[in-house]
Each structure stands twice: as C-alpha cells, then as structure tokens.
C-alpha cells in the first residue's frame, strides 16, 4: 500500500465521522520516503475497522440515541505513521472544504472501485489515531478547521495542554498516571538502579521524562537512558542491547516506555545476542498484554511486568467479529488482504486475490482460531459512543422537540460540538462512567500484567495487580513465588557498620563504594565520618561518641 492509492472504508449516513486506524504496520526505514506501509494488522487494524462499522450499526439501531439521524463513517489507514496520517487527514479536510455544488469528491469504495459521490458530506469529527506522535500531528491540522478529535489510545501528557490541542479529547488517561504506576512498582521491589529505554516519538519521550522526574524524587537512579525508533533496524537494536548489558549485573531492570514493536525489537535482539533471562523488562501500556509483541520470543520476555489500561473484553464485538468471512464482508476493503495474511492462503477468484500464497483458502477457515481481541477495543468503542452522545446532546439543545437534523444544526459547528463533547457523561461499554475533565482527559485505571511460563513451552500474561488513582496493589507471591526470587536491581549494596558511602565524581547517587571510618571516627551521616572530640570514643555501633571514663592510676595498679 503506497501513497499513490489509498483505500477508504465508507459507510453512508446523515452525519459522517472520520476514523484513523493503523490498518497496516508503519513503513520500514527504507520505505518511509515513499510512505509504503507494512503488513496488515489484525488487532490494531482490522478489528478496529470492524468495531467502528458495527458500533455505528448498533448506534443507528438504538431508538434512544440520535433518533432519525444515521451516523456514517469514513475510515482511513494511518499506518501508525505521521506522514501517512497527515496525508489522510488532509483528505478528511478536503472532503469538508469541497462544496457539493462546486465539485464531486472521488472516494475509494469498500468494494475497491472508484465512485463519485455527489454532495460528499464533511467529516464532523475524527476518531483516533492510536499513536500519540501521530495524534499530535493530526490534531495540529484538525484544530485549524474546528474538527474535534477523540483518541482511544494516544496517552501522551502533552495532549492535555488545551492551549496547544484545543480540539483533542481522549477516553484514556494521560501517561503521567502510568509513569507514576511504573515508579510505584520499582519502589515496591526496592529497585534503586534501573536502565531506561523509550520509543523515539512523543509517547515514549514524554512518558519517560515523567518516569525519570518521578524516579528522581523517589531516590531511584537511572543507570542510563536510551531511545530508539520502533522501526529501527537489527543493528540499532543490537547496539542498544550491548549498551544495556554494560550495566549488568547491577541494572537488571529495564524500564521501557515503549510502543509494542520497540519491545519486540528488543526481544529479537536478546535472542540474537543470547541474552534471554538477563533482564527484567518493566513495560508501559504499549506492550500491555499483546501477543504480537512476544510471539516467537517468549523465552526472552518471561518475567516481564507490564502496565495495561483497564478494559475488559467486549463480548458483543466477538459475537459479531468471529462470524466475519470473505463471503460475508465486502464493506471492509482491507478484509480480503487480512484474511489471506492471517491464514497464509490465497482467496482464489476474489477481487484482492494475492498470488504470493500457493495454498487456496478453504471454507472451514474461521476467525475463532487463535482469536485475541484487541486490548483497547473497549476504548475504541467508547470513543465512537462519545462522538454519538456529543452529537445527541448537541441535537437535543439545538433542535428541541425535533427528531433528526434541524436547520440550526446544519452544517455542524465544530465549536458547538466540542462544547457538547466535553460535557458528555455516559456509561461505557464495560459499565464504567465515561467523562472528560477540563483537559479532555479521562480518569486512569490500570492492570499490572506479568508474562510467565505457565507450563512446558506455554507462556501467558497473568493479571498480578492493579493501579487505581494512585493506589498500587500487587500479588507478590504470583510474581515471584518466593521472596528470595525477587530480582535485585541496585548499583551498590548498603554499607556495613562503620562504613560510609563515597560517591565517585560523575556517578549517580545510587552508586558508591563503602569506606570504613577511622578508628576515632563515627558515622555522622551516610556520606560522612566525624572524629570524636578529645576525651570521647566511638560507640560500639559507631553511630556516635561516648565519653571515655576517667581512670585514675594508683600506685599498686598493674602496668596497662
């Protein structure tokens, strides 16, 4: 999929909502200039496309939500890449600017053909994209045209700044909260010396910055901090791993504020360099409980502790999604490509038949095989519902007593819609309350996951705790099985009695050498020895001085 031909999924309606999903992986470094995207993605791509289509169907059939108004959508592929997403957002804007009287918009239909839609409706709002860096670029464009944007997984703290990102909202919390959760885990296990890695880009950079700031306040030292692009080559990952190895055996814990594919790159490098079991990775929600991160590299990932946004599976989505087949799905223009990629077979005779596969797909194939629901599915659906409720509230206030779109609502004013969205308050897909604070952010609840070997060659993520509004709960026995197994990640061991810490010039405060005080000195504080005054001597525990008792010599006393 390259820049000259972009596929769009379109669903007709009275009001059109735009969406940006990473239907394909980002371009590899050598393909960035031509914006040629990678392989099709299931969880982050196809499932989210289907979630949009089916959620709109549910909204449209709900008589209490936007009665007499049909919501439609236009879904575009962001490829998890700023340049591609910007190009696609410009298309959204173009649609909004083209007047139906002046020009016809050309759209790529879900069946793959080109078709002219007279009076192409403008996009009233945009759902997504997933990546913070990409969301920022998209927001910079959308806000110029007063188009509200609701994100489902862009968690960067920068996006809370309403002076910069006025039309941005999200159904997920800011990363400041998960940075705090990560620091709380490090504190809990007394890891005072850790290495740090983050994905180059806004998500990783701002998240790691918060992690480092909070760590410093808690007396946690960062051995060294590294950054790397998610799509960096093998050599870059190998180089990074060698640097991390240089801090062993002291910095065993590696805090990774990373996108999932960065973690996968690290795991692959561990395999190449034979470093399985050398590190314990503490990962942010970019990793969470994704199997596409660990598949094939489970041994390297074992022990990993990850943060996952709390979002239970959505049953009704699976009921819908697992029935989909190439014969039953022609509104999703990427579905045939995905089916062939998923089952490594050729859909013989179908419009998007891929001849690179030798085997023909047979009728017994089903998505039920090895199905894993996108971990952020609930957020995607909540973002779509937020847009619907915002429009519903707007319609109620602008068109009282009127079912459908009244003249006062046409064309939809983005400023009024934003106001309405910010006041939205409804019960989300998992029964939780969805609301937005003054920054357009949602409250934060996280699950703590642990990647474990459950049996011979069987690995899985286990829920070992939670972090909710500043409170960390962990099942230590589940993580470590016994206290002695707790990994140590410290630069220097505590000094013995009568010793002080000497920090070498240029070293962090967690690394020291222990030096004993002189015979007449006591430990004044952990860094200083002080001599006892004349007539006094260090106490047995060397924490102070006792006066030397005066002994008078008598004529008959033996020689001392």
């Amino acid at each position: 999929q390259s820049s000259e031909r972009r596929v769009v999924a379109h669903m007709p309606g009275d009001i059109i909502i735009g969406a940006l999903f990473s239907v394909h992986h980002q371009p590899t470094v050598d393909k960035v200039h031509e914006r040629k995207c990678g392989a099709v993605r299931e969880q982050y791509g196809i499932q989210r496309v289907e979630a949009m289509l089916h959620t709109l169907e549910r909204i449209n059939s709900d008589p209490t939500l936007l009665p007499n108004i049909t919501l439609g959508c236009e879904i575009r592929d962001s490829c998890w890449h700023s340049a591609v997403a910007l190009e696609q957002s410009i298309e959204f804007i173009r649609d909004s600017l083209i007047s139906s009287e002046e020009e016809e918009g050309l759209v790529r239909c879900v069946d793959g053909s080109s078709s002219s839609f007279r009076s192409k409706k403008p996009i009233v709002g945009v759902i997504g994209p997933g990546s913070s860096s990409v969301a920022i670029q998209v927001q910079n464009l959308l806000q110029l045209f007063n188009i509200p944007q609701i994100a489902y997984s862009a968690t960067s703290m920068d996006l809370s700044d309403k002076t910069l990102f006025k039309y941005f909202m999200r159904v997920v919390p800011s990363d400041a909260q998960q940075a705090r959760a990560m620091v709380d885990i490090v504190k809990r296990y007394n890891w005072t010396y850790v290495s740090a890695v983050h994905t180059e880009g806004n998500y990783g950079e701002s998240g790691m910055e918060a992690f480092k700031d909070m760590s410093a306040k808690e007396g946690i030292c960062i051995a060294h901090s590294y950054k790397i692009y998610s799509n960096a080559g093998e050599q870059s990952f190998d180089k990074l791993l060698k640097k991390l190895t240089s801090h062993l055996p002291k910095a065993r814990v590696v805090a990774c504020f990373c996108e999932g594919m960065t973690v996968r790159g690290l795991l692959m490098a561990m395999r190449r360099l034979g470093l399985a079991g050398e590190f314990l990775l503490l990962g942010s929600d970019g990793w969470a409980d994704r199997y596409d991160v660990t598949d094939g590299y489970q041994r390297e990932a074992v022990g990993g502790i990850t943060i996952k946004l709390q979002s239970p599976d959505v049953k009704w989505f699976d009921d819908y999604y697992l029935k989909l087949r190439p014969e039953t799905n022609h509104r999703n223009p990427w579905f045939q490509e995905f089916w062939q990629h998923r089952f490594q077979c050729r859909l013989e005779g179908f419009p998007q038949e891929n001849s690179k596969y030798n085997k023909t797909c047979n009728s017994s194939l089903t998505l039920k095989t090895h199905h894993v629901q996108d971990s952020k599915m609930g957020f995607v659906i909540n973002a779509i519902y937020s847009m619907a409720y915002g429009l519903h509230n707007m319609q109620m206030s602008l068109c009282p007593g009127y079912a459908g779109l009244c003249d006062a609502m046409k064309p939809i004013d983005g400023r009024k819609l934003l106001e309405s969205l910010m006041k939205t308050n409804f019960t989300g897909v998992s029964g939780d309350t969805i609301l937005f604070d003054e920054n357009g952010d949602s409250p934060g609840r996280y699950e703590i996951m642990n990647f474990k070997e459950m049996g011979k060659d069987y690995f899985d993520y286990i829920n070992v705790g939670s972090w909710d509004n500043g409170e960390l709960k962990m099942d230590d026995d589940e993580v470590w099985s016994k206290k002695s197994n707790i990994i140590r990640s410290v630069c220097s061991e505590p000094c013995e009695k009568g010793q002080i810490k000497v920090i070498r010039k240029g070293e962090v405060s967690c690394c020291w050498t222990c030096t004993p005080c002189k015979e007449n000195e006591y430990v004044f504080d952990e860094y200083t020895c002080k001599a006892c005054q004349l007539g006094s001597w260090p106490t047995d525990d060397l924490t102070g001085c006792d006066l030397i008792p005066v002994q008078y010599l008598r004529w008959g006393d033996p020689e001392p």
Epitope: C109, D111, G112, S113, K323, R325, P326, E327, T328, N329, H330, R331, L347, E348, G349, F350, P351, Q352, E353, T360, C361, N362, S363, S364, L365, T366
Partner: antibody
C-alpha cells in the same frame, strides 16, 4: 443428494416451514446451504444461505420474513411467515462444498409452494 | 447492494452456431462468478465456476470469461440439447445482496 419437503398450499398471511434433507453426507462446518426460489415462468431468486450451524445470511428483500436454521446434522429449514401470493414458487435448497466462495454444485429437485386463498 | 444484470433476455441461434451471454455485476466480484443451465422442470446445473473453470462433466464447448464486473458465457457448436435458460450468479458475497442471480437468458436452438 438433497431433497426439499414441506411444500404445498398455504393461505395468504400464513406460515410455512420447508426442510432440506441431506443423504449420503452431513452438513459440516464448512458447507454453505442455500435456499433459492423460482416463481412460475420466472428466473432464479436467491433467498439466503447458512454457513455452519449458526451463521445465516439473507437477501435484502428476505430479511425479516424468512429464517434459515440448521436443525440437525442432516437437515436445514426455511421458515416463511406472513406469506403473500407473490411467494408462490418452487423452492430449491442447494449446497456449496469446497474452497471460499459459494458456487452451488448440488441442488435438490425443489418443492412447490402455492400461496392462495 | 450487489445485483446482477444479464443480457440478452432471450436469443435464438441455429444448430452449430455460437452464442454469447453477458453478465454484469453492480460491484466488483473478482472472478467469483458461476454459470448455470436450467431446463424446464429441473433444478439448475452448474456449468462454470470462478468465471472460467468448467465443472466436471461439462463440455468444452462452454467457455466462461471476464473478471471484476464484466463476464461472458460463450457456447459454440450449438446442439439441440443446449436449449435451456442460462443464469449467472455472483459467488463472492452473501451480504447486502438484492439477488445473487442474473435475470436469465433463454437460448432457443433452431
């Protein structure tokens, strides 16, 4: 082979259930079983299909009044409600077995349904 | 919605002649098209699937072609036994369909 049964005379507004029975094979999870009808002197009209035992799909015009279900490993039914005279036709069931797509390679002889008062 | 348009509705051809029936899909279906032959009082019989593949036991005088939205069935060296009604059917999708079959073409052999 396939054989349809349950056809006959029914009054307008009535309900009728047709059954498609397989002989020599049973409906597995990879079969498409479809219903097609043909009004006297007219062309073939696709009603809908069922894939496996649960997933049924109807033509746009057949949604609501026509329901396809698998009742056993060798029978599939077509339930028709609120029948108008225009539903008078020969009803065929047909099977697709093979790769993706649903070309119908095995047909039953058909059963005639007459809707008249 | 998917529907199929078949032309002509009826055609008369002499024995030994050639006839071409056309079928148009409203949206692209790749090569997922089948052709059936139906004689009075009988169920349809599959002739061609995947636009051009002959079903087993079908004479090579029947030839299917096309892809995307435009398809054709050509019968050469017509025989009296070929007198029948021929239908095309899109065999790609089972959702959002008005009719999977074309309207039919009656072939009369003189």
């Amino acid at each position: 082979s396939l054989e349809e049964s349950g056809g006959g005379l029914v009054k307008p507004g009535g309900t009728l259930t047709l059954t498609c029975t397989a002989s020599g094979f049973s409906f597995s999870s990879s079969y498409w079983i479809c219903w097609v009808r043909q009004a006297p002197g007219k062309g073939l009209e696709w009603i809908g299909c069922i894939y496996g035992s649960t997933d049924a799909y109807n033509a746009n015009w057949a949604k609501g009044r026509f329901a396809i279900s698998q009742t056993s490993s060798t029978t599939v039914t077509l339930q028709m409600t609120s029948l108008p005279a225009a539903d008078t036709a020969t009803y065929f069931c047909a099977r697709h077995d093979g790769d993706i797509g649903w070309t119908l390679d095995l047909w039953g002889p058909g059963t005639l349904v007459t809707v008249s008062s | 919605a998917y529907d199929m348009t078949q032309t002509p509705a009826s055609v008369e051809v002499a024995v030994g002649g050639t006839v071409t029936i056309k079928c148009q899909a409203s949206l692209t279906i790749g090569t997922r098209l089948a052709w059936y032959q139906q004689k009075p009082g009988q169920p349809p019989k599959l002739l061609i699937y995947k636009a051009s593949t002959l079903a087993s036991g079908v004479s090579s005088r029947f030839k299917g072609s096309g892809s995307g939205t435009q398809f054709a069935l050509t019968i050469s060296d017509l025989e009296c036994a070929d007198a029948a009604t021929y239908y095309c059917q899109q065999a790609a999708y089972v959702t959002d369909i008005d009719n999977a079959f074309g309207g039919g073409t009656e072939v009369v052999v003189k």
